[in-house]
Amino acid sequence: PPNRRTCVFFEAPGVRGSTKTLGELLDTGTELPRAIRCLYSRCCFGIWNLTQDRAQVEMQGCRDSDEPGCESLHCDPSPRAHPSPGSTLFTCSCGTDFCNANYSHLPPPGSPGTPGSQGPQAAPGESIWMAL
């Protein structure tokens, strides 16, 4: 690889723990997404909280190591936890620059492989860009 991995960096107010130490923040100014250059991996992650039909970004940044899923070119989130009734946390890992900025769709909030109501969808060929 010619370059160190660069990911979108975001932490919602009130999230516990920070992944800021897993990279070096780039000085991007105010109107652009914050960017972080990963120190220990070539892998980005994103966490979204799906409540009813609204997805909110919780965290974006660098992973601490390269693990399964990091070879993915795009952010394809899978449901991970139910922090409160009616809400589901979706996470993705991916291994291209800024791949954690967006997702093409969210799978059903039920556990992987089980049917459930569909999350907010992008139109075919589109991506949902998270407003940071």
């Epitope: 370059n3 160190r4 991995r5 070096e24 120190l39 390269d66 620059d97 800024f98």
Partner: antibody, heavy 113, light 112 residues
Framework: QVQLVQSGAEVVKPGASVKMSCKAS????????VSWVKQSPGQGLEWIGE????????NFNEKFKGKATLTVDKSTSTAYMELRRLRSDDTAVFYC??????WGQGVLVTVSS | DVVMTQSPLSLPVTLGQPASISCRSS???????????LEWFQQRPGQSPRRLIY???NRFSGVPDRFSGSGSGTDFTLKISRVEAEDVGVYYC?????????FGQGTKLEIK
């Protein structure tokens, strides 16, 4: 095939600005960083900075902050570098490069009164 | 800034003979992700630089296999197994591990 075609040579006066272009073709412009490199006459190479066309995020050599501004036009797959407050020691060839694997032909900027 | 020091600065070589260029960095170029972001470029007279090697030892597409790169940490080498006339030019090492990225001062290869 991947190509980076840069604008023509410029002769400018001290204190002026210059904006050069780098038109990319043969690949998905938004998927690769575009870097800029300076080569002063008879000298080596100096990394100026880089920009990611998809979102406009840039990363600079501290030495060139305030001197260089990097922008892109995604609709024409073109990267731009503007140099401000030019001095005689800014006389150089400036290259654009796609993550250093493919390079433009260079733009000679001559600063002279 | 990380200083990249090349030697020799001038390298006269007989056609068909091997050539070797050394590059030493002032800090280790092994990054926390396990990769070493060290590259080699060739600049022929009047031309733009051309990437030869990335990641210490990976040849870029279209680069003849007479070019090879090796090394680790702070010491790196570019070798040309048999020099050809078209190899004349200046060779630069480059690091992208630390900001700002930096080039070596260049080694001028000429035919004896």
């Amino acid at each position: 095939q991947v190509q980076l075609v840069q604008s023509g040579a410029e002769v400018v006066k001290p204190g002026a600005s210059v904006k050069m272009s780098c038109k990319a073709s043969g690949y998905t412009f938004t998927d690769y960083w575009v870097s800029w490199v300076k080569q002063s006459p008879g000298q080596g190479l100096e990394w100026i900075g880089e920009i990611y066309p998809k979102n406009g995020v840039s990363n600079f050599n501290e030495k060139f902050k305030g001197k260089a501004t990097l922008t892109v036009d995604k609709s024409t797959s073109t990267a731009y570098m503007e140099l401000r407050r030019l001095r005689s020691d800014d006389t150089a060839v400036f290259y654009c490069t796609r993550q250093r694997d493919y390079w433009g032909q260079g733009v000679l900027v001559t600063v002279s009164s | 800034d990380v200083v990249m020091t090349q030697s020799p600065l001038s390298l006269p070589v007989t056609l068909g003979q091997p050539a070797s260029i050394s590059c030493r960095s002032s800090q280790s170029l092994e990054y926390g992700d396990g990769y070493t972001y060290l590259e080699w470029f060739q600049q022929r007279p009047g031309q733009s630089p051309r990437r030869l090697i990335y990641g210490v030892s990976n040849r870029f597409s279209g680069v003849p296999d007479r070019f090879s790169g090796s090394g680790s940490g702070t010491d790196f080498t570019l070798k040309i197994s048999r020099v050809e006339a078209e190899d004349v030019g200046v060779y630069y090492c480059f690091q992208a591990t630390h900001d700002p990225n930096t080039f070596g001062q260049g080694t001028k290869l000429e035919i004896k």
